[in-house]
Interface confidence: low
């Protein structure tokens, strides 16, 4: 809920539909990157406000007679990460009336993403010739996951996943070995996670 103790009056949902809020180049970036938050209204608006939910005033205003407002966050720091929402309003709505807030956009500013876990499904000990599934699980959605095998320089498999995990299938004959994984943002500027702890797959 973005309605704080002062100054924001949000009308019922039927009044003015919520805008869309997105981030360029990404919602996960390293410190020092310039981030643009774009708030797009479903109709031309007069003023846009960018909020961190729960704060009593907007972080930024933009007065633009169009459907799109851009908020520039220069050389972001980890402290600027967190939840953001935007609203818009038109002068004919009367002061104090804003649209419904956009869905929350989570901005993460970090040097390194949290270490993922790597587990074998159903377990790390498999029957000879049986396929095995490895799950690399991070904490963020829409990431690219990479599986490594010890002794092999190149990544073994890639997966892009909308979920905070990715599953890799190992064919039975080649399954035994030592594996690790990591994940990263799907586009530049890339933010990488730490590597997972290693997982040893062996035959019964």
């Amino acid at each position: 809920d973005i309605t704080p103790s002062v100054a924001i009056i949000v009308p019922p949902a039927s009044y003015h539909p919520k805008p869309w809020l997105g981030a360029q180049p990404a919602t996960v970036v390293t410190p020092g990157v310039n981030v643009t938050l774009r708030c797009r209204a479903p109709q031309p608006a007069w003023r846009f406000g960018l909020f961190k939910p729960g704060e009593i005033a907007p972080l930024l205003f933009r007065d633009v007679s169009s459907e799109l407002a851009e908020f520039f966050l220069e050389e972001v720091t980890p402290a600027q990460g967190g939840s953001y929402r935007c609203c818009y309003r038109r002068p004919d709505w009367g002061p104090g009336v804003w649209s419904q807030p956009s869905d929350v956009l989570e901005l993460l500013v970090t040097e390194e993403l949290p270490r993922p876990s790597l587990v074998a499904l159903p377990g790390p000990v498999v029957g000879p010739g049986a396929n095995v599934s490895l799950r690399c699980a991070g904490r963020l959605r829409n990431m690219s996951f990479v599986l490594y095998r010890e002794g092999v320089a190149a990544p073994l498999q890639y997966r892009h996943s909308a979920q905070p995990w990715a599953d890799f299938t190992l064919l039975g004959a080649r399954a035994p070995g030592t594996y690790s994984c990591y994940y990263h943002t799907p586009s530049a500027p890339y933010v990488l996670s730490q590597r997972s702890e290693v997982l040893v797959i062996s035959w019964e």
Partner: antibody, heavy 118, light 108 residues
Framework: EVQLLESGGGLVQPGGSLRLSCAAS????????WTWVRQAPGKGLEWVSG???????NYAQNFQGRFTISRDNSKNTLYLQMNSLRAEDTAVYYC????????????WGQGTLVTVSS | QSVLTQPPSASGTPGQRVTISCSGS????????VSWYQQLPGTAPKLLIY???NRPSGVPNRFSGSKSGTSASLAISGLRSEDEADYYC?????????FGGGTKLTVL
């Protein structure tokens, strides 16, 4: 601490000019609508002019052409240039910050007295 | 002559409930929000109510605001001697901010 401090008031002759300043501290000056409100001795509050975050300033009809509002975001300061002053402009002039909706004034300065007299 | 009309004076005894009215038109109060300010003698106005009925933090819940049609009202319950002040309503009309003429509240 959030503070507004007006200055520049004083005694001026009819037809003269005066420039009022309002120095703000404690929040991001550039993010807000700023306004001047005046109060003649023993009278009520009267809105004078406002400076939006972007776009043209707006004025109450009585002041259009004689008064000019401006702001310097780098100095966190709001100004009111008053020309062709009349005796009826004698008042305490308050600078105030609008709540972000622009619909109300949530922080006020202590006011500066302008006296127009010969 | 103010566009928003308030009674010039109101009074009450300690502990009483007092209501101050503010009358406008469809172009201001009727279509916009109303705020209320308290001005103690010799001081700057202070925001009491915004958006018709919302209290900023720090304002006691003895103060309440409401709006109906083209009129608004400020109610003060449990009246105290320190409530003796001038009270102003404020709204918005076609890019201008409008104030009522003010009501002087006397605590008897």
């Amino acid at each position: 601490e959030v503070q507004l401090l007006e200055s520049g008031g004083g005694l001026v002759q009819p037809g003269g000019s005066l420039r009022l300043s309002c120095a703000a501290s404690g929040f991001t000056f550039s993010d807000y609508y700023w306004t001047w409100v005046r109060q003649a001795p023993g009278k009520g509050l009267e809105w004078v002019s406002g400076s939006p975050v972007f776009g043209a300033a707006n004025y109450a009809q009585n002041f259009q052409g004689r008064f000019t509002i401006s702001r310097d975001n780098s100095k966190n300061t709001l100004y009111l240039q008053m020309n062709s002053l009349r005796a009826e402009d004698t008042a305490v002039y308050y600078c105030a910050k609008a709540g972000f909706t622009g619909g109300h004034f949530d922080i006020w300065g202590q006011g500066t007295l302008v006296t127009v007299s010969s | 002559q103010s566009v928003l009309t308030q009674p010039p004076s109101a009074s009450g005894t300690p502990g009483q409930r007092v209501t101050i009215s503010c009358s406008g038109s469809s172009s201001n109060i009727g279509n916009n929000y109303v705020s209320w300010y308290q001005q103690l003698p010799g001081t700057a106005p202070k925001l009491l109510i915004y958006g018709n009925s919302n209290r900023p933090s720090g304002v006691p819940n003895r103060f309440s605001g409401s709006k109906s049609g083209t009129s608004a009202s400020l109610a003060i319950s449990g009246l105290r001697s320190e409530d003796e002040a001038d009270y102003y309503c404020q709204s918005y009309d076609s890019s201008s901010w409008l104030f009522g003429g003010g009501t002087k509240l006397t605590v008897l």
